[in-house]
């Protein structure tokens, strides 16, 4: 019962996590214009992995895709790659874990097979979550570096009269969504791995040791000891699970749609 619950919960948590990773990857607000000095702005800039956007105070929003591939920073390409790998691994993990769920019967699938599939999906979720966390963290580090660089030359004087204000960017909503989603996927993966241990049929050899007293007399000599031992046949202690006895309701979770402004 506890194993089924752990497995089911792990699946649901991972599902929410992967939905979050997909959402974060698609979101435009990975970096947003820093409004520390000017909380009310007429032009608000924000950027995602795939396009950059400008929201005017008039309400109009204009987004432009990054149509170049070679012209993009290597770090951005790396973040894209990490997020996509995370999504792909997570999606495969979800597919595998659906068939591994104890509450779903597929033909005469052995518990050992389900255990292996659960472990596989768990590892995939862990790697997926780590990819997402790594991707978001790399981007965040890039932002911090750029933030302090642009702060150092916030104003570039032109003839001592004209000022060019450099736009500084700070953490966008997508980073927090990505971190939380990656964490959830990671937790879900760990739960699946824990559930796998409970699913696996344990084959433990308990060697029964029997001591037989010898029929003939034993002469005890100083400094010496002799005893004969007889070993009985090994007995296998096998745990048996009643897989089909109980069925539990399948839990489905749908990611809610948020509008990040």
């Amino acid at each position: 019962m506890a194993v089924t619950a752990c497995q089911g919960l792990g699946f649901v948590v991972s599902l929410i996590g992967i939905a979050g990773i997909i959402a974060a990857t698609c979101m435009d607000q990975w970096s947003t214009q820093d409004l520390y000095n000017n909380p009310v702005t007429a032009v608000f800039n924000y950027q995602g992995l795939w396009r950059s956007c400008v929201r005017e105070s008039s309400g109009f929003t204009e987004c432009r895709g990054y149509f170049t591939l070679l012209g993009l920073p290597a770090m951005l390409q790396a973040v894209r790659a990490l997020m996509i790998v995370g999504i792909v691994l997570g999606a495969i993990g979800l597919l595998v874990s659906i068939f591994a769920l104890k509450c779903i019967r597929i033909g005469s699938m052995e518990d050992s097979a389900k255990a292996n599939m659960t472990l596989t999906s768990g590892i995939m979720f862990i790697v997926s979550g780590l990819c997402a966390i790594a991707g978001v963290s790399v981007f965040a580090n890039m932002l911090v570096t750029n933030f302090w660089m642009s702060t150092a030359n916030m104003y570039t004087g032109m003839g001592g009269m004209v000022q060019t204000v450099q736009t500084r960017y700070t953490f966008g909503a997508a980073l927090f969504v990505g971190w939380v989603a990656g964490g959830l996927t990671l937790i879900g993966g760990v739960m699946m791995c824990i559930a796998c241990r409970g699913l696996a049929p344990e084959e433990t050899n308990y060697k029964a040791v029997s001591y037989h007293a010898s029929g003939h007399s034993v002469a005890y000599k100083p400094g010496g000891f002799k005893a004969s031992t007889g070993f009985g046949s090994n007995t296998k202690n096998k745990k048996i699970y009643d897989g089909g006895a109980r069925t539990e309701d399948e839990v489905q979770s749908y990611p809610s749609k948020h509008d990040y402004v």
Epitope: Q33, N38, V40, T41, A42, V43, N45, Y46, Q47, S52, C53, V54, E56, S57, S58, G59, F60, E62, R64, V162, Q163, T164, V165, Q166, T167
Partner: antibody, heavy 118, light 113 residues
């Protein structure tokens, strides 16, 4: 088509308040901010502030902060601008103007002349 | 606040000739996010509200004749009327649309020589 119709001319005494209305038609009123601009006789244009009709949140030019209040009535698609503690230098034509692309003002009201005189 | 300075304050040009009005801002109006300059040009005739001519420094508003064109980037901008018509006689204003408070130039009065 989009139209912005403003209330009639006003004559006020110094220290008094004036409230000008701007009725919008031809578009969804809550979709676009309403800006207010004034022009003193023979002088240039001066931006007073704007208001988001959807949230009712205003943004003011700090020069007028504390004296100007921008409000909206979404049921009648009307924007209001109230200027208090009037001085003679507040004598001007007051315009309401709709927002467009590039934060520009493509649609303007006909203007309301406010005369402050003792 | 961003200060907008227009030059000249008045300009006399013959009909059919080219008219050029300059506008300088105390701060760059170029937005790095979309590489657009947030500068708008208006035309105002006596007794009328201003009329939008160009936004984003060079994008013509619909219905505006193509003899009106805008150029410039950052802090220096120009409004050009390629062939002056009688109906173009008015006061022209440039406006900062990049940061609050929005500010206007003092205006350039265009007259017939």
């Amino acid at each position: 088509q989009i139209q912005l119709v403003q209330s009639g001319a006003e004559v006020k005494k110094p220290g008094a308040s004036v409230k000008i209305s701007c009725k919008a038609s031809g578009y969804s009123f809550t979709d676009y901010h309403m800006n207010w601009v004034r022009q003193a006789p023979g002088k240039g244009l001066e931006w007073i502030g704007n208001i988001d009709p959807y949230y009712g949140s205003p943004t003011y030019n700090h020069k007028f902060k504390g004296r100007v209040t921008l409000t909206v009535d979404t049921s009648t698609s009307t924007a209001y601008m109230e200027l208090s503690s009037l001085r003679s230098e507040d004598t001007a034509v007051y315009y309401c103007a709709n927002y467009g692309r590039g934060n520009s003002f493509p649609y303007w009201g006909q203007g309301t002349l406010v005369t402050v005189s003792s | 606040d961003i200060v907008m300075t227009q030059s000249p304050s008045s300009l006399a040009v013959s009909l059919g000739e080219r008219a050029t009005i300059n506008c300088k801002s105390s701060q760059s109006l170029l937005n790095s996010g979309n590489q657009r300059n947030y500068l708008t040009w208006y035309q105002q005739k006596p007794g009328q509200p201003p009329k939008l001519l160009l936004y984003w420094a060079s994008t013509r508003e619909s219905g505006v004749p193509d003899r009106f064109s805008g150029s410039g980037s950052g802090t220096d901008f120009t409004l050009t009327i390629s062939s002056l018509q009688a109906e173009d006689l008015a006061v022209y204003y440039c406006q900062n649309d990049y940061s609050f408070p929005f500010t206007f130039g003092q205006g350039t009065k265009l007259e017939i020589k």
